[in-house]
């Protein structure tokens, strides 16, 4: 484990920094210049630095479970868990699910009454007894209800011609009811005769386009528990259709833009506001069904099976069965689907804040194990055979006290999980002994907490009316800098620089802005290593014989000497055995300056005075022309021809010498003087 911490100055902040962090509460554990943050480290590090094991604060996450033996049948246990969560450290507990025999069932039959379902309706009218008998084979307490749907009653979903609204069926002689979105026909009941009677009254209807408004109807069945009569038992919703479904966004086709609000809108058992709200999205419906523990069974004709199988991938605890064209096999289909649904157990939790993470390990009875999944999942669960889920809950920070619920989808049992933070350190301080804090504070986990008006490691500094901001101001280089460059403590307005763990690194300076290792490196070593130079505040100070920004060069000038053994021809300096020439002069030896202006014009007066002892410098030639030496023999170099003070042309040659503005000058004996007009 590791402990990554930033600006930790208390035990609580340390514990919040990560599961690997522990705090040493030992008195005087920190030395001069040590920040309080060195009390926060991994357990092995603190032990190694001399903190006794019983001085190490390391609160851990833990789980306490409580059974609730009141009430009836319990398929989930425990009923209540209390978790104490330390940030980053999971608390784990086991949840056992034991599938009960004969668990009560509510079954609501929701049927598509569009015209193509005419023969299906005939069969369903006779179904009541069979359905209840089938339920009673599974449970001692079964109830059935009935509802039907067509679609929204606006174009393009239905034909809005008044005649077609009265009788939407293609066969005019057929008695047919006007289209509707959803009608709740029969509240859940154990009376099969009532089912037969009420369903028997139902007439077929019709619509225009192929998809139906089934999702609208399902949303109302889930959102209206009182009206439907759902009990707190296994809730099955049989959805019978021979076609697809409209979903969120399709409402726009009929100018219905308001998103589905997921609320109950039944008036006189009809969803009368269906033309105001769009269809629900599949995700929205899935959430509502799960929230209300409703398990849908899609009884659909063969051509629709694939479509609805895709739907069951999104809706947890749902099943698909192939409905014969006339619904004659529906009882058999429901039995199969129920067995399939009740033998698969999903363990899930309600929505949580981002600060809590929950994962499940599922240990299923058939030897299958799923680890670290976002929900528990076991298939083939048999009656009275317990299965175990290990639930791991992790908080990413010190959380507020809160609770959440874990449920087996489709079942009513819940586990209530109360979550509390585990962030406080129960340090055994001699906290009443104020002498350790100069009598101006009390001890908390080994650190002095100072009274108002006092600051410092041992409350030794009296603020004397100065605010802590003022005192801290003297510990900042400028307003944009952090206190003591983040590398020291501001004590009484002065930086006390921290001790570094890095070998050879000392932090110093008024604002702890300097150290002895952050300099350029050469050959992987600071300032080329201790034999070449020393590092101070980002600059290498090289030993004699070495130079360069990282002391990378041996001090030698061989590469800088011209044929006359003058360093850089006197027109530059030698660094790292290479010339750095003055502006314009060229490497390697600063001999040539192609871009420099011609010296001819500059030296005409010198040529005049040196050779002919005339001109403006005639009287003090040597002082005016210190860099020039007259040669009696011709020289190599730049040839010049300039007018002198008397208007005569003087020819001379300048040969550059080592150094700046130093020349050997040869001047022609004769001048060319042009006579003026008579």
């Amino acid at each position: 484990q590791e402990c990554t911490k930033f600006k930790v100055s208390s035990c609580r902040e340390c514990i919040e920094s990560g599961p690997g962090c522990t705090w040493c509460q030992k008195l005087n554990f920190t030395g001069p210049g040590d920040p309080d943050s060195i009390r926060c480290d991994t357990r092995p590090q603190l032990l190694m630095r001399g903190c006794a094991a019983d001085d190490i604060m390391d609160p851990t996450s833990l789980a306490e479970t409580q059974e609730d033996h009141n009430g009836g049948q319990k398929q989930l246990s425990p009923q209540k868990v209390t978790l104490y969560l330390r940030p980053g450290q999971a608390a784990a507990f086991n949840v056992t699910f034991r599938r009960a025999k004969g668990y009560p069932i509510d079954l609501y039959y929701l049927m598509d009454l569009s015209y193509s379902m005419l023969d299906d309706l005939r069969n369903v009218k006779k179904l009541g007894g069979d359905l209840l008998r089938a339920l009673n084979e599974i449970t001692e307490s079964g109830r059935i209800g009935f509802g039907s749907f067509v679609d929204k009653t606006v174009l393009p979903f239905v034909n809005t011609h008044p005649d077609k609204l009265r009788n939407p069926c293609p066969n005019k002689e057929k008695e047919c009811q006007p289209p509707f979105a959803f009608r709740h026909v029969l509240k859940l009941t154990n009376n099969s005769n009532q089912f037969q009677t009420e369903v028997g009254k139902q007439l077929i209807s019709g619509n225009l386009d192929a998809p139906e408004g089934g999702l609208d109807a399902m949303m109302q069945v889930a959102a209206c528990p009182e009206e439907i009569g759902w009990r707190n038992v296994t809730r099955l919703l049989v959805f019978a259709t021979d076609d697809g479904f409209h979903f969120a966004g399709d409402g726009k086709l009929g100018a219905i833009l308001t998103p589905n609000d997921g609320r109950c809108h039944l008036e006189d058992n009809l969803y009368k506001r269906s033309n105001e709200f769009d269809y629900p999205s599949v995700g929205q419906l899935a959430h509502k069904l799960a929230e209300n523990n409703i398990q849908p069974i899609f009884a659909v004709t063969s051509r629709m099976v694939k479509t609805y199988e895709k739907l069951t991938e999104i809706i947890p605890k749902s099943a698909v069965g192939e409905l014969s064209e006339d619904s004659s096999n529906v009882v058999h289909l429901i039995k199969n689907a129920y067995n399939k649904l009740s033998s698969r157990v999903f363990l899930d939790h309600n929505a949580l804040p981002d600060t809590l993470k929950v994962t499940y390990d599922s240990f299923c009875s058939n030897g299958v194990t799923h680890r670290n999944q976002p929900r528990g999942d076991c298939d083939g669960v048999q009656i009275n055979v317990p299965i175990t889920f290990q639930v791991k809950v992790t908080a990413t920070e010190c959380i507020q006290e809160q609770s959440f619920v874990i449920r087996a989808l489709g079942f009513t049992d819940i586990v209530t999980v109360q979550v509390l933070p585990q962030c406080e350190c129960r340090c055994r301080d001699q906290s009443r002994d104020r002498s350790l804090c100069h009598g101006k504070g009390f001890l908390e986990c080994g650190i002095c907490r100072c009274d108002t008006g006092y600051i410092g490691k041992n409350c030794e500094c009296q603020t004397q009316g100065r605010s802590s901001q003022e005192l801290e101001g003297s510990c900042r280089k400028d307003n944009n800098s952090i206190i003591c460059s983040g590398l020291g403590d501001c004590v009484c307005g002065q930086c006390l620089c921290h001790t570094s763990d890095v070998p050879g690194k000392l932090i110093y300076g008024q604002y702890c802005e300097c150290d002895t290792i952050n300099c350029e490196r050469y050959n992987g070593q600071v300032c080329g290593g201790p034999g070449r130079g020393l590092c101070f505040c980002g600059k290498c100070r090289c030993h004699p014989g070495f130079e360069g920004s990282a002391c990378q060069c041996e001090r030698t000038t061989e590469g800088c000497l011209n044929p006359r053994r003058v360093e850089c021809s006197g027109r530059g300096r030698c660094r790292c055995n290479v010339c750095e020439c003055h502006s314009g002069y060229q490497l390697p030896l600063c001999q040539e300056c192609p871009g420099c202006p011609s010296p001819c014009g500059k030296y005409i007066s010198c040529a005049e005075c040196l050779k002919f002892e005339k001109g403006p410098f005639g009287k003090n030639c040597s002082a005016a022309c210190p860099g020039l030496q007259l040669s009696n023999n011709p020289v190599k170099g730049r040839t010049c021809k300039e007018r002198d003070s008397e208007g005569c042309w003087v020819a001379y040659t300048l040969e550059q010498q080592d150094g700046m503005d130093r020349y050997l000058i040869y001047v022609d004996e004769s001048r060319e003087c042009v006579a003026g007009p008579n």
Epitope: P32, H498, L506, Y508, F536, C537, G538
Partner: nanobody
């Protein structure tokens, strides 16, 4: 102007002790890094010990456990207590003051350890 004046040193027997002292002037002493360095004949100058104003120290491996560096911020002095001296400790010992990246050296004091 920063000035450093060393004192102490001289001839000492192997296994013996000596204390070097360095007094600084012309600087706000509490912000600077102080150190002792040495240079043996024909060798490069090397670190002996350094100390910050908050008393964090750094020693050369060869002197750890034998030498102790200390400073008195009020008196603006830095001392080097050298115990269990060995002949290889023979060198000119220089006091150093670093103010930010600027470095100032003392004139050096000779320590000779005879066997």
């Amino acid at each position: 102007e920063v000035q450093l004046v060393e004192s102490g040193g001289g001839l000492v027997q192997a296994g013996g002790s000596v204390r070097l002292s360095c007094a600084a002037s012309g600087v706000i002493f509490r912000f600077v890094l102080m150190g002792w360095y040495r240079q043996a004949p024909g060798k490069q100058r090397e670190l002996v010990a350094q100390i910050t104003s908050s008393d964090a120290t750094n020693y050369a491996d060869s002197v750890k456990g034998r030498f102790t560096i200390s400073r008195d911020n009020a008196k603006k002095t830095v001392d080097l207590q050298m115990n269990s001296l060995k002949p290889e400790d023979t060198a000119v010992y220089y006091c150093l003051l670093a103010r930010g990246p600027d470095v100032y050296w003392g004139q050096g004091t000779q320590v000779t350890v005879s066997s």
